[in-house]
């Protein structure tokens, strides 16, 4: 008996071939001997089966002795043995219809679980193997689960169902809802303007939800809500904004905020959360602000940084085109009685300069100038 695998919702074509290459009488029946379709001369006739409106044949092939049964919009319950009667012969074809669906929505928040469920006909014992967009293979029986979805899991999942050494392939598009970056860090000199961007890693036609940016300044004992906003069909509307700092937020995606100037009291970490309509849980992006200040007070030249810096970052003070006078893994460095000239304060990571502030030290009878 020939076995054919089909996919729920698809169309299948079961073949039936006569030895004579001409149009002769044929009938297709199911295992209950109920006629599905056949011919009467050049006319297609249909029987009383449940497939009535979904069954068809290809009349153009009859003259070649081919009498296919075409079943459209396959259902799991279409799984059956189909019998083609032609030239006093009976050809049997076993059709097994499978369906693979994501248990929940195919738009899932980062960190959530994806469950794929296989619908299969009674008596079948299929195995399933799925390959994620990042090349990870998972195997299972009737259900497959992937916990802690990551951004790289967004895309087309290819699942292969194996039964009777035959296979059928399913493709499921999964969208992982997340920000492009889990965390970002902005380095600024005191007084510079700050821009925070929160690009999303997905695109959907209509995006609705609400969000908030909480800020934990390094100098503050508790965190503070800087801004709350709504998102309706990709349009951002600010609901409430703190008066200090005077934040501005763009009305279009990607989410974008500007801070008029970087000040030591703003240095710290923020957490932007976005709750999407009809989704449980929230999207998160952490943003960090590091602020640098170089000052000269009397005979002391000081360079300080505020904000979340890693212990391996190096803070240095050097006279332009000379070796560093002082270089430490600390958040403040200073030079007593600095020579006149252009001094540079550098925050660097493994030799790569992240932030630089210049200060001009004038001869001792003058006051310093910050360019």
């Amino acid at each position: 008996k020939k076995v054919v695998l089909g996919k729920k919702g698809d169309t299948v074509e079961l073949t039936c071939t006569a030895s004579q290459k001409k149009s002769i009488q044929f009938h297709w029946k199911n295992s209950n001997q109920i006629k599905i379709l056949g011919n009467q001369g050049s006319f297609l006739t249909k029987g009383p089966s449940k497939l009535n409106d979904r069954a068809d044949s290809r009349r153009s092939l009859w003259d070649q002795g081919n009498f296919p049964l075409i079943i459209k919009n396959l259902k799991i319950e279409d799984s059956d043995t189909y019998i083609c009667e032609v030239e006093d012969q009976k050809e049997e074809v076993q059709l097994l219809v499978f369906g693979l669906t994501a248990n929940s929505d195919t738009h899932l928040l980062q960190g959530q679980s994806l469950t794929l469920t296989l619908e299969s006909p009674p008596g079948s014992s299929p195995s399933v193997q799925c390959r994620s967009p990042r090349g990870k293979n998972i195997q299972g029986g009737k259900t497959l689960s992937v916990s802690q979805l990551e951004l790289q899991d967004s895309g087309t999942w290819t699942c292969t169902v194996l039964q009777n050494q035959k296979k059928v392939e399913f493709k499921i598009d999964i969208v992982v809802l997340a920000f492009q970056k889990a965390s970002s860090i902005v380095y600024k000199k005191e007084g510079e303007q700050v821009e925070f961007s929160f690009p999303l890693a997905f695109t959907v036609e209509k995006l609705t939800g609400s969000g908030e940016l909480w800020w934990q300044a390094e100098r503050a004992s508790s965190s503070k809500s800087w801004i709350t906003f709504d998102l309706k069909n990709k349009e951002v509307s600010v609901k409430r904004v703190t008066q200090d700092p005077k934040l501005q937020m763009g009305k279009k995606l990607p989410l974008h905020l500007t801070l008029p100037q970087a000040l030591p009291q703003y240095a710290g970490s923020g957490n932007l959360t976005l709750a999407l309509e009809a989704k449980t849980g929230k999207l998160h992006q952490e943003v960090n602000l590091v602020v640098m200040r170089a000052t000269q007070l009397q005979k002391n030249l000081t360079c300080e940084v505020w904000g979340p810096t890693s212990p391996k970052l190096m803070l240095s003070l050097k006279l332009e085109n000379k070796e560093a006078k002082v270089s430490k893994r600390e958040k403040a460095v200073w030079v007593l009685n600095p020579e006149a000239g252009m001094w540079q304060c550098l925050l660097s990571d493994s030799g790569q300069v992240l932030l630089e502030s210049n200060i001009k030290v004038l001869p001792t009878w003058s006051t310093p100038v910050q360019p």
């Epitope: 821009e195 501005q248 763009g250």
Partner: antibody, heavy 117, light 107 residues
Framework: EVQLVESGGGLVQPGGSLRLSCAAS????????MTWVRQAPGKGLEWVAN????????YYVDSVKGRFTISRDNAKNSLYLQMNSLRAEDTAVYYC??????????WGQGTMVTVSS | AIQMTQSPSSLSASVGDRVTITCRAS??????LNWYQQKPGKAPKLLIY???SLQSGVPSRFSGSGSGTDFTLTISSLQAEDFATYYC?????????FGQGTKLEIK
Amino acid sequence: EVQLVESGGGLVQPGGSLRLSCAASGFTFSSYWMTWVRQAPGKGLEWVANIKQDGSEKYYVDSVKGRFTISRDNAKNSLYLQMNSLRAEDTAVYYCVRDRYDALDIWGQGTMVTVSS
Amino acid sequence: AIQMTQSPSSLSASVGDRVTITCRASQGIRNDLNWYQQKPGKAPKLLIYAASSLQSGVPSRFSGSGSGTDFTLTISSLQAEDFATYYCLKDYNYPYTFGQGTKLEIK
């Protein structure tokens, strides 16, 4: 043809009221934010107010807040600007403009409002 | 509110000249900036949207550039019909703000 036609301008005394209308045609009015922009004689352009597609959100320039009200009737493809407590500095040509989300792209020919005693 | 500073306020040039008008935002506005042309007694006309995208039907001699705080409108080779007043518009957030305008006159 995409078109915006303003009406309702005229001469009004300080403290008086006026209602401007804008008739839209040639596009799906209910799919767009709409805007009023004004231009005082010999001066530059000033954004006045915006209204969302369904009228649920409205924004105004500070100088007209509490005096002007933007509204719309999607069934009639019409935009309105109710102007109360008018001042001499409100004298301007008022333009009805379509907000395409990334630009103010279609402008009416404007209607003149003169506030004078 | 974010302020927009347009310069120069007026400019004299000749047909065939290359002309540049600048607009500066007091805070970063990404590329949420448009350029308009207005002729006397007429409504403004959209030239450039999203800082650098040319509006359909606008001649290619007009171009826009910039992002963040500094933006430029360039007319590569002035034509007689280009003598008009030009405005930038910030539509990053509310309130929308126009630049003060640049009057482009024949030298």
